[in-house]
């Protein structure tokens, strides 16, 4: 029975060229997290954090993605093409799979509002 809930940073915006933290948090469950997957809007994998093996950043994102903080992900050198949905998928035992959604809007530097709670200045 899946009792947990995923909390995310929700809808966030950040400056072109800047950085942003994507963060999900699983609560209200005793389940043990065995792996967290981070996917982009086109379902391409950015990174995986496996409990035993640690972080794996996919080659296409190696230069612009940094693991953490925690189970989150830091996106750097943002471009307008980074605008879109991001998904965290928590694989947990014995509950199964939890999924969270974040929408990132990358704005031209002159109009960006610092709306992200976890955003890096």
């Amino acid at each position: 029975m899946m009792t947990g809930t995923i909390e995310t940073t929700g809808n966030i915006s950040a400056k072109k060229g800047g950085s942003v933290i994507l963060q999900c948090h699983l609560s209200s469950t005793m389940a043990q997290v065995t792996q967290v997957n981070w996917e982009q809007h086109d379902h391409s994998l950015l990174a995986i954090r496996n409990a035993e093996l640690g972080w794996h950043i996919y080659p296409a994102f190696k230069d612009r993605v940094a693991p953490g903080p925690g189970l989150g992900l830091t996106l750097q050198s943002l471009t307008m093409n980074d605008t879109g949905e991001y998904f965290c998928t928590y694989h947990t035992y014995p509950d199964g799979t939890y999924r969270g959604r974040i929408f990132l809007e990358v704005l031209e530097s002159s109009v960006a509002e610092h709306s992200a709670r976890f955003q890096i200045p």
């Epitope: 029975m1 005793m30 389940a31 043990q32 997290v33 065995t34 792996q35 409990a51 035993e52 694989h91 035992y93 014995p94 199964g96 799979t97």
Partner: antibody, heavy 121, light 106 residues
Framework: EVQLVQSGSELKKPGASVKVSCKAS????????MNWVRQAPGQGLEWMGW????????TYAQGFTGRFVFSLDTSVSTAYLQISSLKAEDTAVYYC??????????????WGQGTLVTVSS | DIRLTQSPSFLSASVGDRVTITCRAS??????LAWYQQKPGKAPKFLIY???TLQSGVPSRFSGSGSGTEFTLTISSLQPEDFATYYC????????FGQGTRLEIK
């Protein structure tokens, strides 16, 4: 080599308590949930529940609440099962089994060699 | 709770035979099913996960199939070391084991 080594057989009187240990080696103890499984003489396998090796939080399956306690000592990579107020029907082989995983799929591997607990007056 | 029913409960076969064990779930469990082999006095041995994925080191004569509510474990050509009890296990909604299938030499 990944392995689980359990403590030896126990002969106990009704009303007594027993503590079974399960020492893990060959892997990161806190990266994998640990389960306990009971097998009464001539019977099948019965999942007793599991313990989150990150948090120490135990979860008990139906029929295994009250007299059964799962615990950990992460400093020595060991899980414990304690049964109090033993009854004749607690006579069984008790196994610890690590949860293995790949993405959203889970299984039990490896298993400890089993500990026979005999309750007799 | 999801119940797993294995059939048959007892099976007599000869070396070289092809045998199939069925495991039925009381409700759909997708492919969240594992198979184990247990010999007398020994701990269970893990064989298959995700209904059909063979664990490394398990002989290729073992295979699993199915999804939803009906699953099978097939041994294509029985070897002497295969005579044992086999259990299915669902990992979709907490965990339960089937009652076991005892495979004996005819």
């Amino acid at each position: 080599e990944v392995q689980l080594v359990q403590s030896g057989s126990e002969l106990k009187k009704p009303g007594a308590s027993v503590k079974v240990s399960c020492k893990a080696s060959g892997y990161t103890f806190t990266s994998y949930p640990m389960n306990w499984v009971r097998q009464a003489p001539g019977q099948g396998l019965e999942w007793m529940g599991w313990i989150n090796t990150n948090t120490g939080n135990p979860t008990y399956a139906q029929g295994f609440t009250g007299r059964f306690v799962f615990s950990l000592d992460t400093s020595v990579s060991t899980a414990y099962l304690q049964i109090s107020s033993l009854k004749a029907e607690d006579t069984a082989v008790y196994y610890c089994a690590r949860t293995g995983y790949s993405g959203s799929y889970y299984w039990f591997d490896p298993w400890g060699q089993g500990t026979l607990v005999t309750v007799s007056s | 709770d999801i119940r797993l029913t294995q059939s048959p409960s007892f099976l007599s076969a000869s070396v070289g035979d092809r045998v199939t064990i069925t495991c039925r779930a009381s409700q759909g469990i997708s492919s969240y099913l594992a198979w184990y082999q247990q010999k007398p006095g020994k701990a269970p041995k893990f064989l298959i996960y995700a209904a059909s994925t063979l664990q490394s080191g398990v002989p290729s004569r073992f295979s699993g199939s199915g999804s939803g509510t009906e699953f099978t474990l097939t041994i294509s050509s029985l070897q002497p070391e295969d005579f044992a009890t086999y259990y299915c296990q669902q990992l979709n909604s907490y965990l339960t084991f089937g009652q076991g299938t005892r495979l004996e030499i005819k």
